[in-house]
Structure formats: C-alpha cells, structure tokens
C-alpha cells in the first residue's frame, strides 16, 4: 500500500509518457490520475516501467474499477497483465478475440500461467462454446491447449472447430479426450474423399471404434505404426489379421518391432497362430492351432 502524499510542484502527470519511469513509487501514486491512466493505457506497454511501478499503476486502476476493469482497459494492459492475479481476472468480462490475443501475446513463449488459464476460461465461458476462431488462436499460442481440457469441456467444441486442430495439438491428449474429439472430427470431415479424409482424421483415431477401423482397412490407407500404436486397445482386439494387414499396408512389417507393446501384444494374443504366420513376420503368442476360442462376453449378452 502506497502512502497518500501530495504531488510535488510541477510533477503532475499531464500524459502517460517515459518521464514517469523516473518517478518514485509515491510520486506515481500522487501525481498520476487514475482516469488519465485508464484512457492512455495503450502507452503503458511502450514504457519500461519497473514491476514496482506497475504495482502502483495497477493499484490506481483497482481503485478506479473495484468491480473489474472494462474491456477498453483490459485490451491495452500489456505488461501490466503480468501483475494481475486470477482473482482480478475473474472480475473481467472479456468478449473480444482481439483482447484475448493482445493478452496472450504478453505471455508468448512462456508456459501457461494460472492467470492465462483463468483468462481463457472466462473467455470461453463467455462465448458459450469453443468456436473455430478461438481454438485457432489458443492452439497457436499453446499447442497443448486442447489436451488440457477435460472431456466435459471438450464436449462443448463444435465439429466445425475441428478444422482448426493441427496434429501437434493432440500430442498430449489421452484416450478419454480423443473419445470425445473423434466423433466430432468424423462429422467435420465426412464430406472428404478417402485419402484426404484419412490425412485429416489420422490424428484423432485414438478415439475410433472397431467398426471405423474395419471400414478404414477397406480403403488402402497405409496407416503408419505410430498411429496404430495410439489406437484404443479395445478397438484393435476384434480386428482380424487380414484387416490389420490391409489397414497397415506396407507398414505391417513394423508389427514385429512392437510385438511386446500394447495394443499389438494384446492383439497377437487374440489371433490364431496360423493367421499370424501368414504375415511372415515371425509373430509369436497367438492361439495354438486346434484350440477353441469362446467369446464369453457374447455368451453373457445372450443369457
């Protein structure tokens, strides 16, 4: 808290300019009018104030706007944004994408802070859904943003927004998140032809069900092993050897190197050894010839 002292003669600020960096904290408090500051916020960012001085300027704005800053001020906060707490930000009503971009720019190149997370949360909640332009902006600044959302939050993403998602945006997503995103992607890309569709849907396939993988196996897609290894184990298990061979195309040879890792390991255990041998890869661990496989889950469903 800065003590209230009279402004020395001749030091009253008529505008926000670089001369203010030479003011002591108490002089800033006494000589800068909060209303002047609010109308000239765009200048603050161009002036190399110390963090201590920024604290004083923030204090002046807090007194002027105890219920939260108007968007006209928020948009021009610049470095002063680095002085805001999540509690401050929760008082804001940010509706303009330009304001969001301006504030994200301040933290560009640095990891997401609680302040940025709060800002994004306020913005998205205010919009009601994560539209394409917002998603475009957020993933440009934070490629991992999408995967930081809960499945519940992801459910508010409209399929049209999926066009903004790049493969790297999904790198850290877990299966629960991909389960939500995959149907949206399928819907978004449904009018594309086979090869183009596969290029777009590939990053989302960690959420694909068995029937969709079976359908893809009929389309000569040549899925790479990295994508195959990210598929849901429960979706891969029912695939036949022939279907996996068609799905992977020339990449099928990569199964040998992955035979001890899921989902390949679990899939091998479900296949007849005879069928695995047809691949000529030396995959071992399949069901020996002459053994009968009972699908107990099917039996339970019938009883």
């Amino acid at each position: 808290e800065v003590e209230k002292t009279a402004c020395p003669s001749g030091k009253k600020a008529r505008e926000i300019d670089e001369s203010l960096i030479f003011y002591k904290k108490w002089e800033l408090e006494a000589c800068v009018d909060a209303a002047l500051l609010a109308t000239q916020m765009d200048r603050v960012n161009a002036i190399p104030f110390t963090y201590e001085q920024l604290d004083v300027l923030k204090h002046k704005l807090d007194e002027l706007y105890p219920q939260g800053y108007p968007e006209s001020v928020i948009q021009h906060l610049g470095y002063l944004f680095l002085k805001m707490s999540p509690e401050d930000i929760r008082k804001w009503n940010v509706t303009s994408l330009e304001t969001l971009k301006a504030l994200l720019e301040v933290n560009k190149g640095h990891e997401m802070s609680p302040q940025v997370a709060t800002l994004i949360d306020r913005f998205v909640k205010g919009r009601g859904q994560l539209d394409k332009d917002t998603l475009d902006t957020l993933t440009a600044f934070y490629p991992g943003y999408l995967c930081s959302l809960s499945p519940e939050e992801l459910s508010s993403v409209p399929p049209s927004s999926i066009w903004a998602v790049r493969p790297q945006d999904l790198d850290t997503c877990d299966p629960r998140q991909l389960d939500v995103l995959y149907p949206k992607a399928r819907l978004a890309f449904q009018n594309m032809n086979g090869s183009e569709y596969f290029v777009k849907i590939q990053s989302f396939l960690g959420g694909a069900p068995t029937e969709d993988l079976k359908a893809l196996s009929q389309q000569n897609v040549s899925m790479d092993l990295a994508t195959f290894m990210k598929l849901r184990t429960d979706a891969v298990l029912p695939l036949t050897v022939a279907e996996v061979q068609k799905l992977l195309g020339p990449h099928v040879e990569g199964l040998k190197a992955e035979e001890r890792h899921r989902p390949v390991r679990d899939w091998i255990l479900r296949q007849r050894q005879d069928d695995l041998d047809t691949l000529g890869l030396g995959l071992q661990g399949g069901i020996p010839n002459g053994y009968l496989v009972l699908d107990l889950s099917m039996q339970e469903a019938l009883s």
Partner: nanobody, 119 residues
C-alpha cells in the same frame, strides 16, 4: 534466476570519463528491461538510465547528453554505461538492475560499483 556483476568503477577527475559494465548470467533469455541506478551516501536510490527490451534508451534529465546506456543481447548479456563529462555530483554507488518476464515478474540487482569524481 539472473546474476548481475558490475565492473568499471573508480576514481576519476571532473570532466573525465568511465565505462561501467554489467555482466548478466543465468536465465538471460528471460530478461526484459535493464537499468542503471545510483545511490550517493545518505541518499535514496535514483534511476539513471534504462534500456528497454526493444533497445530504446531513457535518461535522467541531469545525465542526458553525457551518459549513454547500451546492451548486447548475445550469449553473455552485457549492460554498459558510458559516462562522459563527469561531475562531482555523479559520485555514487552505481547498481545494475534487470527484470524478467513472468508471473510474478522478478527484479534482480547487482552489488554495485563505486564511482568517485574529484574536483
């Protein structure tokens, strides 16, 4: 963390020149603005000059035209203060300061280098 070490101070006659240096090490990529402050015996800390992250320089009125602040953003960030036409009233401990990006933004200080101007 950023470490700052000043050098270049000393005793000089009025009208003479000195060049102060401040070497920064540690998380130098996160440095935003850099500054020279000074503190004369029994007086408060006074900002002498600032160089912003975009290279713009700002000077205290009484040193404008005599002092020049500059910085290099190479692997070893260095801050300089070229002081010409020195006056006895410039005598003080000159301290280097840098601040960094982030929440909360942090301020870092050197130990200072003494400048004494004799008349």
């Amino acid at each position: 963390q950023v470490q700052l070490v000043e050098s270049g101070g000393g005793l000089v006659q009025a009208g003479g020149s000195l060049r102060l240096s401040c070497a920064a090490s540690g998380s130098i990529s996160s440095i935003r603005h850099m500054r020279w402050y000074r503190q004369a015996p029994g007086k408060g800390l006074e900002l002498v000059a600032t160089v912003s992250n975009d290279g713009s320089a700002y000077y205290l009125g009484s040193v404008k035209g005599r002092f020049t602040i500059s910085r290099t953003n190479a692997k070893n960030t260095l801050l300089y203060l070229q002081m010409n036409s020195l006056k006895p009233e410039d005598s003080a401990l000159y301290i280097c300061n840098a601040d960094t990006w982030g929440w909360p933004g942090a301020d870092y200080w050197g130990q200072g280098t003494q400048v004494t101007v004799s008349s």
